[in-house]
């Protein structure tokens, strides 16, 4: 058996700093949560801790503070590189300044892979932003492969601005190609990551052959096992299992929003990368968890000019 | 076990090239970052070049640049330093060494134990 | 380019001491530091990684820590086996650098 821990953000929505609890500005900082200081002390934790870590963003780190009014997406490229992402996929928000806010700031500033199976350019931006998101890709992990397919909210048109030259065709049908393009690489552990919402995410791991975890964003689902640690109520179980037509428990997660708590699910494959066992919980990021000191200095920095825009 | 064993190391003349074998085994080659590191005769440790798991992405130390090159053959778990123009400079021990599973840079967790090059007229 | 600023270049120690290495980084380089052990005529070894992470293996006595631009390695009593040499190596960004080494020699 081969485990695999999986770290995941969805929904973070600008809040680079600290929150208060109800994830406004903080205000009282020994009761603060969150913010990507806090954030890289907990995944380094784990990562030295545990062997096989994957940390995954599930989209719509666009919009929601002042940090994405003024920087546009240039502080998600910067921090989320500064914390080591291993993929994002892309969720409506990432199109809300057009298809070039996002491919200067993000795609072109990112060191990880951008992912969305179901997003497909035409005309005279299919050229342009080629390469610089990806249906899928296959992450070494350890020893091991495993294969990361995207997928984006298809309302996003309605939501944001992607213009009219990326088509966003239904997640199932775009998805399953891709998955089915990743078995015959040979890989045989495979995570749909994408922004449609709850709804969406479990009906990707009802009909998608061959996915095996679902990490899912945009309705902001609060799953937890036990007595929840803060305010949110869960939606269910983390994971929630949804049972496959071709009759596979496959889980799915999510982990609320705006970087209040970090998804954490640990998975079991056997040899042929079946599932043998998952369960987890999202880890609330409250003031028990140090802001690391190096990251928080360079959010200070940044915070400089944030400060300057605001007066 | 998992083991790394250079060879190709030799004396040389300044303005030759030679080229540098690293064989591996023990671990999935084709998952890692690789990396050269050399130490000349009496001094510290000096970084190289990099090529990530996939071939995709190569980064070479200032003081080799357009000179050196780096490749990999992942059917044959073997990493591969090319060496043009040798300077007297170049003279050191060429160690190669592993790094992480991903596109950052990273540590190295293991080492081979080097070979021996000496740029000389 | 990150410049790796060891301190001491050499110490003398005995046996059961504690001995404490200083590494400095020229810019923030986060916890991407690694501390390396070598040994006359042979290569060395990884001893700690993300500045206080033991490489599997390696005594408990030798521990890191740090962040930001100050680092620390410290052996919390030396042993006949520890004499060698110790660097640093930033891993924040290209091109990696290491520090100039610390010769750890008999008292």
């Known amino acids: 058996a081969w485990e695999l821990t999986i770290l995941h953000t969805n929904d973070v929505h600008s809040r680079l700093e600290q929150t208060s609890e109800d994830s406004s500005k903080c205000v009282n900082a020994s009761r603060c949560m969150g913010g990507v200081a806090r954030l890289f002390t907990k995944v380094q934790q784990i990562r030295r801790a545990e062997p096989n870590v994957l940390l995954l963003d599930a989209g719509d780190q666009y919009q929601g503070t002042i940090w994405f009014t003024v920087y546009k997406g240039a502080e998600v490229a910067h921090f989320m590189n500064a914390l080591r992402y291993d993929a994002m996929a892309l969720g409506n928000h990432e199109f809300d300044n057009g298809v070039e806010g996002l491919i200067e700031p993000l795609l072109k500033e990112a060191k990880f892979p951008i992912l969305s199976a179901n997003i497909k350019a035409k005309g005279p931006l299919a050229s342009q932003i080629s390469g610089l998101y990806l249906p899928y890709k296959v992450l070494p992990v350890g020893d091991e492969v495993v294969g990361i397919v995207g997928y984006t909210s298809k309302e996003t048109p309605f939501l944001s601005n992607p213009g009219t030259n990326l088509v966003f065709e239904d997640e199932i049908t775009a998805l399953q190609p891709e998955v089915d393009k990743l078995k015959t690489l040979n890989v045989n552990k495979i995570i749909a990551l994408g922004h449609s919402g709850f709804e969406m995410d479990k009906l990707i791991a009802q009909k998608v052959r061959g996915v095996d975890v679902v990490v899912g964003g945009h309705s902001n689902t609060f799953l937890y096992t036990g007595n929840p640690p803060s305010k949110e109520v869960p939606a269910g179980k983390y994971p929630f299992i949804v049972t496959s037509d071709d009759g596979r428990k496959v889980p799915v997660v999510q982990a609320y929003a705006f970087g209040k708590y970090l998804g954490y699910l640990k998975i079991e494959f056997d040899e042929r990368g079946n599932v043998i066992s998952s369960h987890g919980n999202p880890i609330l990021l409250n003031s028990s968890i140090p802001e690391d000191p190096s990251i928080k200095a360079d959010i200070n920095k940044w915070r400089i000019k944030l400060d300057n825009y605001s007066t | 076990q998992v083991q790394l064993v250079e060879s190709g190391g030799g004396v040389v003349q300044p303005g030759r090239s030679l080229r540098l074998s690293c064989a591996a085994s023990g671990f999935t080659f084709s998952n890692y970052g690789m990396h050269w590191v050399r130490q000349a005769p009496g001094k510290g440790l000096e970084w190289v070049a990099v090529?990530?798991?996939?071939?995709?992405?190569?980064y070479y130390a200032d003081s080799v640049k357009g000179r050196f090159t780096i490749s990999r053959d992942n059917s044959k778990n073997t990493l591969f330093l090319q060496m043009n123009s040798l300077r007297a400079e170049d003279t050191a021990v060429y160690y190669c060494?592993?790094?992480?599973?991903?596109?950052?840079?990273?540590?190295?967790?293991?080492w081979g134990q080097g070979t021996m090059v000496t740029v000389s007229s | 380019d990150i410049q790796m600023t060891q301190s001491p270049s050499s110490l003398s120690a005995s046996v059961g001491d504690r001995v404490t290495i200083t590494c400095r980084a020229s810019?923030?380089?986060?916890?991407?530091l690694a501390w390396y052990q070598q040994k006359p005529e042979k290569a060395p070894k990884s001893l700690i990684y993300a500045a206080s992470s033991l490489q599997s293996g390696v005594p408990s006595r030798f521990s890191g820590s740090g962040s930001g631009t100050d680092f620390t390695l410290t052996i919390s009593s030396l042993q006949p086996e520890d004499f060698a040499t110790y660097y640093c190596?930033?891993?924040?960004?290209?091109?990696?650098?290491f520090g100039g080494g610390t010769k750890v020699e008999i008292k």
């Open positions: 060494a592993r790094g992480g599973s991903s596109w950052y840079p990273d540590a190295f967790d293991i």
């Open positions: 810019q923030g380089i986060s916890s991407w």
């Open positions: 090529i990530w798991y996939d071939g995709g992405n190569k």
């Open positions: 190596q930033q891993y924040n960004s290209y091109p990696l650098t």
